[in-house]
């Protein structure tokens, strides 16, 4: 059997405050015994990669034996709910989302692995995880209180062709500029060792004499 | 299997009043949100009011002050007492049942926020002529 009931609101209880704590008492007591709502967790916030990717696990505790099970991924943002993607697994194999989804996941037991890609900033949001247990009966159904998933656009890169050339320009820069601060210091230096006495030569004596000889300095003129 | 049973739905002048019960099958844990949706002809299922697992309750802007959500959990029922129909109130009106309170409130003024409930009635018919 099924699950399925309601509470008095609370303005009627008040019609009835002599009754309501035997009603509070059945519905805290009574129903629980008799039905388990299937809970289903989830993180509460995920950072996607820089590439736009973001996985998250979705367990759910199984009132029953499911053997069919029905995993729906909805996003609410801005007043809006939009369903992202889903998948109907047998238990034991893999999840199979449609060959355009953008999600992918695996299962291991009552837990779902869940991987979203190709996110942008813009698709920023809560994202809530739906879990039916479709076979055998009875139905059950349980919705995660959700992940608050952030998508944070990187950086735009330059073309890697434009990035060569800058780079070819730079060094090609360097090499020209490094060449001319060359040929001027040469120019500078060659410059700075020109003769400062012309036709003049002289002969400087030994530092240490050899055999007594001690020689003059002498002069040759220059016509 | 669940089954919600929707009745009280007719034709009336504008003006005038109904009362739109649903009736469950079973009893169910003691979290989740009831809710009545409505679907006009070419438009979308919007969310006219719901209750929350502790009595709290949320109406569309266009509703406020004239339907008043309740239930009866005796008979297990859900009611959508409505006042003063106006003919734009006319459509077929769902009632459903959530999984999660916490999306009880966000139903009202939430684009696709059937998402949220799995179960749901075959719905009843109101038509409010001028």
């Known amino acids: 059997m099924a699950c399925l009931g309601f509470q008095r609101h609370k303005a009627q209880l008040n019609l009835a405050t002599r009754t309501w704590p035997c009603t509070l008492l059945f519905f805290l007591l009574f129903i629980p015994v008799f039905c388990k709502a299937m809970h289903v967790a989830q993180p509460a916030v995920v950072l996607a990669s820089s590439r736009g990717i973001a996985s998250f696990v979705c367990e759910y505790a199984s009132p029953g034996k499911a053997t069919e099970v029905r995993v729906t991924v909805l996003r609410q943002a801005d007043s809006q709910v939009t369903e992202v993607c889903a998948a109907t697994y047998m238990m034991g194999n893999e999840l199979t989302f449609l060959d355009d989804s953008i999600c992918t996941g695996t299962s291991s037991g009552n837990q779902v692995n869940l991987t979203i890609q190709g996110l942008r900033a813009m698709d920023t949001g809560l994202y809530i995880c739906k879990v039916e247990l479709m076979y055998p009966p009875p139905y059950y159904l349980g919705i995660g209180n959700g992940t608050q998933i952030y998508v944070i656009d990187p950086e735009p890169c330059p073309d890697s062709d434009f990035l060569l050339w800058i780079l070819a320009a730079v060094s090609s820069g360097l090499f020209f500029y490094s060449f001319l601060l060359t040929a001027v210091s040469l120019s500078k230096m060659l410059k700075k060792r020109s003769p400062l006495t012309t036709g003049v030569y002289v002969k400087m004596p030994p530092t240490e004499p050899e055999c007594e000889k001690q020689f003059q300095p002498y002069f040759i003129p220059i016509n | 299997q669940i089954q919600l049973v929707e009745s009280g739905g007719g034709s009336v002048q504008a003006g005038g009043s109904l009362r739109l019960s649903c009736a469950a099958s079973?009893?169910?844990?003691?979290?989740?949100?009831m809710a009545w949706f409505r679907q006009a002809p070419g438009k979308e299922r919007e969310g006219v009011a719901t209750?929350?697992?502790?009595?709290?309750?949320r109406y569309a802007d266009s509703v406020k002050g004239r339907f008043t959500i309740s239930t009866d959990s005796a008979k297990n029922t859900l009611y959508l007492q409505m006042n003063s129909l106006e003919p734009e109130d006319t459509a077929m009106y769902y009632c459903?049942?959530?999984?999660?309170?916490?999306?009880?409130?966000?139903?009202?003024?939430?684009?696709?926020?059937?998402?949220?409930?799995?179960?749901w009635g075959q719905g009843t018919q109101v038509t409010v002529s001028s």
């Open positions: 209750m929350d697992t502790d009595g709290s309750t």
């Open positions: 079973a009893y169910t844990d003691r979290r989740y949100c």
């Open positions: 459903a049942v959530g999984p999660n309170p916490r999306y009880c409130s966000g139903a009202i003024n939430t684009r696709g926020a059937e998402h949220y409930f799995g179960y």
